[in-house]
Amino acid sequence: MAVTACQGLGFVVSLIGIAGIIAATCMDQWSTQDLYNNPVTAVFNYQGLWRSCVRESSGFTECRGYFTLLGLPAMLQAVRALMIVGIVLGAIGLLVSIFALKCIRIGSMEDSAKANMTLTSGIMFIVSGLCAIAGVSVFANMLVTNFWMSTANMYTGMGGMVQTVQTRYTFGAALFVGWVAGGLTLIGGVMMCIACRGLAPEETNYKAVSYHASGHSVAYKPGGFKASTGFGSNTKNKKIYDGGARTEDEVQSYPSKHDYV
């Protein structure tokens, strides 16, 4: 039950995260005009990964797409690439994880296959989240660098009346959406990987022979975990899913795929 919950929650968290990554990628407010000394402005500029916009005092907004590939800064291209890779990996991860969900039955799919798919989707979510976080962080770093460069330009070498007040840009809403979404996708991926461990049918090592006094049996806890006897017991505490109380001899004598429902 806990595994199903962990897997389901991981899927939902990742789904929200990837939706957020898509939203952040499409948003126009990656960088917004810094209103450092003028909280009310007649012309407000903001920029996204795909276009830049200007909102006038009347509310009229005009956006212009970046209709060039070669003319764009390499960093912007890199951020675009990271976000797209994040979205693609996340989308594939979601597709894989749907089939991996324990609550969904697809034919006679083995639990081992579901476990592998859960792990795969988990890794994909982790990489997707890292791509988004990296993309947003690269853009944020670019903004910080440009911000201080433009600040330096504003206050040095002017020698009198300032002729051009350079527009400084600061963090836009998309950056925060991207960071949160990337984090959620990452968390969802980790949860999927944790759920995978619980789903994976771990084989008992049947070659080992345990020696103990005759008649001494090893009880099973109601939760399905082997009680540790300390003598000849499996100290790894491996989980079985039928929850039945059997002797260790019985477990060894009748290994069957039905031990793992």
Epitope: N38, V43, S52, V54, E56, S57, S58, G59, Q163
Partner: antibody, heavy 120, light 113 residues
Framework: EIQLQQTGPELVKPGASVTISCKTS????????MLWVKQSHGKSLEWIGN????????TYNLKFKGKATLTVDRSSSTAYMQLNSLTSEDSAVYYC?????????????WGQGTSVTVSS | DIVMTQSPYSLSVSTGEKVTMSCKSS????????????LAWYQQKPGQPPKLLIY???TRESGVPDRFTGSGSGTDFTLTISSVQAEDLALYYC?????????FGGGTKLEIK
């Protein structure tokens, strides 16, 4: 036809207050910013402030903050400007003007102006 | 505040002549976000309110005769009347529409000889 109709001339005593109205017609009042401009006799134009009729949000020229108060009545599509603590410096013609929305913050329609004379 | 300086203070020309008036701003009115200049030109005839002629430094308002042309970028702007008509007798103002507070130039008075 778009029209901005302002009230007639006002003669007021120093220290008093006056409210100028600007009744609009021919367009959707809440869709355009309303601006107010002062023109002292034989002088240039001064922007007082503007108001967004939809939200009632105002932006003032710091020079006129406390002097002018901008309001709107959406039901009658009318903008108002109240001038308080009047002095001889406030004697001028006051215009209401509409922001042209997509015209790079330019004012495309103007009222005929209201002359305010402050005299004892 | 952005200071708008217009020159000359007054012009006296004959009808049919070409006239040019200048407007300079203390800060750039060019917006890099959309590559536009936020400057407007108004015409004010005696006893009338101002009338918009040019916005965005060079775009003619609808209904304005094509003899009126706006040009310039950044801090230097020009209004040109290619062939002055008698009805062009008026005061011409330029306006900073880029930053609050909006500011106007002192005006250029056009007189007909």
């Amino acid at each position: 036809e778009i029209q901005l109709q302002q009230t007639g001339p006002e003669l007021v005593k120093p220290g008093a207050s006056v409210t100028i109205s600007c009744k609009t017609s021919g367009y959707s009042f809440t869709d355009y910013l309303m601006l107010w401009v002062k023109q002292s006799h034989g002088k240039s134009l001064e922007w007082i402030g503007n108001i967004n009729p939809y939200y009632g949000r105002t932006t003032y020229n710091l020079k006129f903050k406390g002097k002018a108060t901008l309001t709107v009545d959406r039901s009658s599509s009318t903008a108002y400007m109240q001038l308080n603590s009047l002095t001889s410096e406030d004697s001028a013609v006051y215009y209401c003007a509409r922001d042209g929305y997509s015209l790079r913050n330019a004012m495309d329609y103007w009222g005929q102006g209201t002359s305010v004379t402050v005299s004892s | 505040d952005i200071v708008m300086t217009q020159s000359p203070y007054s012009l006296s020309v004959s009808t049919g002549e070409k006239v040019t008036m200048s407007c300079k701003s203390s800060q750039s009115l060019f917006n890099s976000g959309n590559q536009k200049n936020y400057l407007a030109w108004y015409q004010q005839k005696p006893g009338q309110p101002p009338k918009l002629l040019i916005y965005g430094a060079s775009t003619r308002e609808s209904g304005v005769p094509d003899r009126f042309t706006g040009s310039g970028s950044g801090t230097d702007f020009t209004l040109t009347i290619s062939s002055v008509q008698a009805e062009d007798l008026a005061l011409y103002y330029c306006q900073n529409a880029h930053s609050y507070p909006y500011t106007f130039g002192g005006g250029t008075k056009l007189e007909i000889k």
